[in-house]
């Protein structure tokens, strides 16, 4: 299910992309699921659709619940689903785990904090940055574009960080907070040539014709953050964004994952409804970073349905 | 390969390398040099499915490799060249399965094209 989870406070902004995606000349119908009534696109609305995106200026709690987005095309439809959460303010500093974003890790080389999903917003520099509820003040704090530098990092900076801007729509200005973790790693990094733990090289896949099957590409590129490393699927050595099959879509997994101190990443090749013609394809799990590429090739094979014992 | 030549340092040249007789769809094609008393070594790669560029860290910022698929072809723009860029420079392919500035990846070798930069 093409899912996502959008969280926001009372009295903000925010603005929410529709999870599936398409070209943009595609017209994007937004429904409210619960009673399949649908989303206006007139700006006058406190809540309205814009092409792929879905606008709560400002968000109120009771706009919590799930959103459909129909992606038409001439060809096909591709349904969407956006859990969005608004949540009353905090009257403390303590940002609780439910609103925050996905933590960073730094080290004295990277030390970037990327303010979450701040280029779905109309928003002009500078940002203003806090931690723990604190403004950021001091020459070693630099609010660069979407993201704060810190300077020569030490373990006291680890912290949550929100960022805090001005979402402009039509002349009237909206604010938005976003709030992530920064753990500062202290071991030295190295960066190796991706090593691909799933899928083994050549492995055939045993698919069922009809039903879904997903494909996982894992690779590992070395310890400590990465600068440059990234996963992707290939169809017959094609993109799958250039190969033109609706029902064939990747996905991002898990985004960094320090498991052991190793930085890997996943991305998830889901195949919707499978059909024969699918068997016939080469799908490439490639990972590649600034020492080179691998590539690990798979197939799919047609599973002989289990027989019913009755 | 053809383009090599000979160039004043600060000058540019354009290397190409025509391939065949190989699957050129999902391969690895190189340029790798090999000066008088030296190793041959990496100097960039590209992944003909997608394009994404590997470099070695002498010419990253100088050297540009890029692809014509539709004529089976790789290029390496060289610019700002200095005297120690002067060497034979060959073209490789390799079957894909590995995309780096590495010889073992490559098992297609080109005859090679001199090229000289003089100070």
């Known amino acids: 299910k093409f899912s996502k989870q959008s969280w926001g406070l009372e009295n903000e902004a925010l603005i929410v992309r529709c999870p599936r995606q398409g070209k943009p000349s595609y017209t994007v119908d937004w429904y409210y699921s619960q009673t399949n009534k649908s989303i206006p696109t007139q700006e006058r609305n406190r809540v309205f659709a814009s092409g792929q995106l879905l606008k709560f200026l400002p968000a109120a709690v009771a706009d919590s619940g799930i959103y459909t987005c129909i992606v038409r095309s001439p060809t096909f439809n591709r349904t969407g689903y956006a859990n969005v959460t608004i949540y009353k303010k905090q009257s403390d500093c303590n940002v609780p785990d439910y609103l925050m974003y996905s933590t960073v890790s730094g080290s004295e080389k990277n030390s970037k904090i990327y303010c979450p999903t701040i280029d779905l917003y109309n928003w002009t520099a500078p940002l203003e940055w806090f931690k723990n509820c604190q403004a950021l003040q001091g020459s070693r704090y630099r609010a660069h574009k979407s993201f704060l530098v810190i300077d020569n990092v030490m373990t006291e900076d680890a912290g949550d960080y929100t960022c805090k801007f001005i979402h402009n729509e039509n002349g009237a200005n909206y604010s938005v907070t976003a709030t992530r973790s920064f753990t500062v790693k202290d071991e030295q990094g190295f960066s190796l040539f991706p090593v691909i733990g799933a899928p083994a090289q050549n492995e055939i896949k045993e698919v069922e014709i009809g039903k879904n099957a997903n494909l996982t590409c894992s690779a590992c590129f070395g310890k400590g953050t990465q600068f440059l490393a990234a996963v992707l699927w290939q169809l017959n050595g094609t993109k799958i964004t250039d190969f033109g099959e609706p029902r064939i879509q990747q996905e991002e997994g898990q985004n960094q994952s320090f498991s052991n101190g190793l930085a890997c990443l996943d991305m998830v090749l889901r195949i919707a409804d499978v059909k024969e013609e699918d068997l016939l394809l080469q799908y490439d799990c490639l990972a590649l970073n600034l020492h080179g590429l691998r590539r690990h090739t798979v197939r799919l094979s047609r599973k002989n349905p289990s027989k019913e014992c009755f | 390969e053809s383009g090599g030549g000979s160039v004043q340092a600060g000058g540019s040249l354009r290397l190409s390398c025509a391939a065949s007789?190989?699957?050129?769809?999902?391969?690895?094609m190189g340029w790798f040099r090999q000066a008088p008393g030296k190793e041959r070594e990496g100097v960039a790669a590209?992944?003909?499915?997608?394009?994404?560029?590997f470099y070695d860290a002498s010419v990253r910022g100088r050297f540009t490799i890029s692809q014509d698929n539709a004529k089976n072809t790789v290029y390496l723009q060289m610019n700002s060249l200095k005297p120690e860029d002067t060497a034979t420079y060959y073209c490789?392919?390799?079957?894909?399965?590995?995309?780096?500035?590495?010889?073992?990846?490559?098992?297609?070798w080109g005859q090679g094209t001199q090229v000289t930069v003089s100070s």
């Open positions: 490789a392919a390799g079957g894909g399965d590995y995309c780096a500035t590495n010889a073992r990846f490559f098992n297609y």
């Open positions: 007789g190989f699957t050129y769809r999902r391969a690895c």
């Open positions: 590209i992944y003909t499915s997608g394009g994404m560029t």
